[in-house]
Interface confidence: low
């Protein structure tokens, strides 16, 4: 059953004398493996014998016998799916039909393949896109219906006989569907390639020529133009004539329209290949070109720059930058339309010519206030001198100048006065808008530049002001020199360094912290009595009577200041001791008698000792000696001794008389 055999292979294979042929082939015999294979050349079926007659190129049978010519023809297949064949070399008389006689255990099949062998290598075929336009990338394809593993070939591209430098991509196909070699070349043709010959050349492995195919390029392109001008340098003066001619060097397809453009804009009613400009004006200066169109699009010539020369036009000045800050750099640029360009410039400042300034630019590296004003210029070229334009204004800004702080008060200023200061300046640009004062006080700071200090303090030393526009300029500080009475007056003991004892040499100093003016007088006072007029009060030998409350006064031309009262304390041993008796120095027996030791001492007496008429100390140590009841035997002279930290003092004798009571006298 023939339907059981399925074959796939190229229908026809192409080669040439001496080359080789590789036949890719697959099959499927559904009833089992292949047992016999014979390759016939031009097989014919013999009805008598029920077999195929023809030249046997290859034979593979069950017993494995192989004909001797089978070295040229090789069966590269297998027993169940591959039926690939190779003939190497292939000859002209191999052309015709190849018959593959296949036999399995139960089935037989004859498969036919066409082989076309030419005498010489056949040419490849170049394929071009339907239309080629300049600068658009196209792919050129060269196709050859041949490929064989045993016979390497190459395809090379030539343009006008010269190898093309673009890299080509070569691919081969040896499949059951197709057998070919293909070369593809990507190429961006220019208008100049129009009409040129492209060749695809088939070569063997050694680069030997085998065959070729050629095509002529038809490159569609916009018109290619050349422009010519009279005069050739395109430099004229106002009133001259100019002629421009447009020539088409190439166009595919033919051109259809012509126009002229100036600075990219079409000139009306100019549709011929010649442009005549009569009595030109400077406005006609510019870039001219001609434009010619075809079906591809418009083509433009190179531009011709027509220069109509004229004397400089009235100039303007550009300032970089105004307003300018004092000390900064400023550049002035003289701008004047002229052709040819100005060769010389004259500069003016406030109408006066600036000497030595002949360039297009004037650079002032360090601007000062006097540079302010109007700047103008005049430009000059070979055709004449331009007019001076309106000029430009340079505004020079700077901080306030020569700022001073001025005291408006009559001098001297006294503590407590109201002081008025003003902030003055010489000049300022822009105007002064505010003022600042140092140090900052509790006073109000009006913006008018006048400062009022109510009740000025003795310690307001210096004041400085600043006048401010965009910047602040500070004046040097001014001294208020406020005058005031002596301050912080106090009494200070200079000697002795320790406590004052009676008899010591004592010095008191009248101190003060400051005084303005410095010239001062001193006064010492005790209990409202003037003691001295020096800064020191001296006692050669102090006595307890000198103790008391002392004050010193310091005065200057502004006023006088007193110290706080200072207490002078003199330490001395107990003195002026005496024994007083209560109720008296005569007491009746049985009554009570109190003896008191009175004394003057600083510090007070801390310890008392009592003595009798025999100078015998009594066992009593308080200030009072109480005798109760008093006896006659107590009569006699008593004295006391007082002790403090400085020393001791004793009293004179005081006599106590104790007399008998009437009862005692009655008993006797």
């Amino acid at each position: 059953d023939s339907s059981k055999w399925v074959f796939e292979h190229p229908e026809t294979l192409y080669a040439w004398e001496g080359a080789c042929v590789w036949i890719p082939c697959t099959y499927r015999a559904l009833d089992g493996d292949l047992e016999s294979f014979i390759l016939f050349h031009n097989p014919e079926y013999n009805k008598n014998t029920s077999k195929f007659d023809g030249t046997r190129l290859y034979e593979s049978t069950k017993d494995g016998k192989v004909p001797s010519e089978q070295k040229r023809v090789q069966f590269l297949g297998d027993k169940n799916k591959n039926c690939t064949l190779s003939i190497h070399p292939v000859h002209l008389n191999d052309s015709g039909q190849l018959g593959l006689r296949m036999e399995s255990k139960t089935e037989k099949w004859m498969e036919r393949i066409h082989l076309n062998v030419s005498e010489r290598p056949f040419p490849p075929h170049i394929q071009l896109p339907p239309e080629i336009q300049e600068s658009q990338e196209v792919t050129l394809t060269c196709l050859l219906n041949f490929s064989c593993y045993g016979y390497p070939i190459q395809l090379q591209w030539l343009l006008e006989g010269v190898p093309m430098r673009q890299a080509a991509v070569t691919s081969t196909s040896l499949t059951i569907k197709s057998v070919f070699t293909r070369s593809e070349l990507k190429f961006s043709p220019q208008w100049s390639h129009h009409g040129k010959i492209v060749t695809c050349q088939l070569q063997d492995a050694d680069g030997k020529f085998l065959s070729n195919d050629t095509v002529q390029l038809n490159v569609k392109h916009t018109p290619k133009l050349e422009i010519k001008v009279t005069p050739s340098d395109a430099i004229v003066r106002e009133g001259d004539s100019v002629t421009m001619t447009c020539e088409v060097s190439s166009s595919n397809p033919e051109y259809t329209t012509v126009s002229w453009l100036k600075d990219g804009t079409s000139l009306k009613k100019q549709n011929t290949f010649t442009l005549n400009l009569r009595e030109v004006t400077k406005d006609q200066s510019g870039k001219y070109c001609c434009q010619v169109s075809n079906d591809v699009g418009p083509g433009r010539s190179e531009e011709v720059f027509l220069q109509v020369q004229y004397a400089p036009e009235p100039s303007t000045v550009q300032i970089l930058h105004s307003p300018a800050v004092e000390g900064s750099q400023v550049e002035f640029l003289c701008m004047s339309l002229a052709n040819p360009l100005p060769t010389n410039y004259t500069w003016y400042h406030n109408g006066k010519e600036m000497q030595g300034r002949t360039e297009e630019k004037v650079h002032i590296p360090k601007i000062l206030p006097w540079h302010a004003g109007t700047y103008s210029c005049v430009a000059e070229n070979i055709l004449g001198t331009g007019q001076r334009g309106p000029g430009a204004e340079l505004d020079v800004q700077y901080p306030p100048k020569k700022v001073t702080t001025v005291i408006q008060n009559p001098m001297p200023i006294r503590e407590g006065d109201t002081v008025t200061l003003s902030c003055n300046y010489n000049s300022s640009n822009p105007s002064v808008t505010r003022y600042e004062w140092k140090p900052h006080g509790a006073w109000e700071e009006p913006s008018l530049g006048v400062l009022k200090i109510q009740n000025v303090g003795w310690d307001n030393t210096t004041i400085a002001c600043a006048a401010c526009n965009s910047w602040c300029s500070w004046a040097s500080p001014v001294a208020l020199n406020v005058q005031y009475a002596p301050r912080d007056v106090r009494v200070r003991k200079i000697k002795p360094l320790s406590e004052i004892h009676s008899g010591n040499s004592v010095s008191l100093q009248c101190d003060f912290s400051s005084s303005h003016p410095k010239e001062v007088q001193f006064f010492w006072e005790k209990n409202g009595r003037l003691l001295g007029k020096e800064s020191q009060l001296n006692f050669d030998s102090i006595s307890p009577e000198d103790a008391g409350s002392y004050s010193c006064w310091v005065n200057n031309s502004i006023g006088q200041t007193a110290s706080k009262a200072w207490t002078l304390e003199v330490l001395y041993a107990p003195r002026r001791l005496r024994v007083s008796m209560s109720p008296g120095d005569q007491v009746m027996e049985g009554k009570s008698a109190t003896l008191t030791c009175e004394s003057d001492a600083n510090p007070p007496v801390s310890h008392y000792t009592w003595f009798d008429w025999n100078n015998q100390s009594l066992p009593y140590h308080s200030q009072k000696l109480r005798l109760e009841p008093v006896k006659v035997q107590h009569s006699g002279a008593y004295w006391c001794q007082g002790t403090n930290s400085v020393g001791k003092g004793r009293s004179p004798l005081s006599t106590l008389t104790v007399y008998y009571s009437p009862e005692t006298i009655g008993r006797r």
């Epitope: 395109a234 870039k287 011709v304 220069q307 040819p340 360009l341």
Partner: nanobody
Framework: QVQLVESGGGLVQAGDSLKLSCLAS????????MSWFRQAPGKEREFVAG????????HHADSVKGRFTISRDNAKSAVYLQMNSLQPEDTAVYFC??????????????WGQGTQVTVSS
């Protein structure tokens, strides 16, 4: 197409001289104001000198005045820069430029590729 090709650059000692040339092709040379610019590493391109279409007037940047001189030869489509008393701060790539207007801005119609000038101390 338009080409501006500079030459003449190289390595010199401070105080030496060099002459740069720029050959133009593909343009009507006499229709263009020709300039030299330079660009030092890490800095912007700056104007050095320029010359009018007929060879006058010429303009020079303040930094090169008295040391560099620009000139042109319209017959040879060439512009030159004679550089004397070269200083290390003149080290840069020097570019030739063709332009319609004579402003000293870094805008030009056509530029060259540049030539390196190195001045060692």
């Amino acid at each position: 197409q338009v080409q501006l090709v500079e030459s003449g650059g190289g390595l010199v000692q401070a105080g030496d001289s060099l002459k740069l040339s720029c050959l133009a092709s593909g343009i009507t040379f006499s229709s263009y104001y020709m300039s030299w610019f330079r660009q030092a590493p890490g800095k912007e391109r700056e104007f050095v000198a320029g010359v009018g279409r007929s060879g006058a007037p010429s303009h020079h940047a303040d930094s090169v005045k008295g040391r560099f001189t620009i000139s042109r030869d319209n017959a040879k489509s060439a512009v030159y820069l004679q550089m004397n008393s070269l200083q290390p701060e003149d080290t840069a790539v020097y570019f030739c430029a063709a332009k319609w207007m004579a402003a000293s801005t870094t805008v030009a119609d056509y530029w060259g590729q540049g030539t390196q000038v190195t001045v060692s101390s």
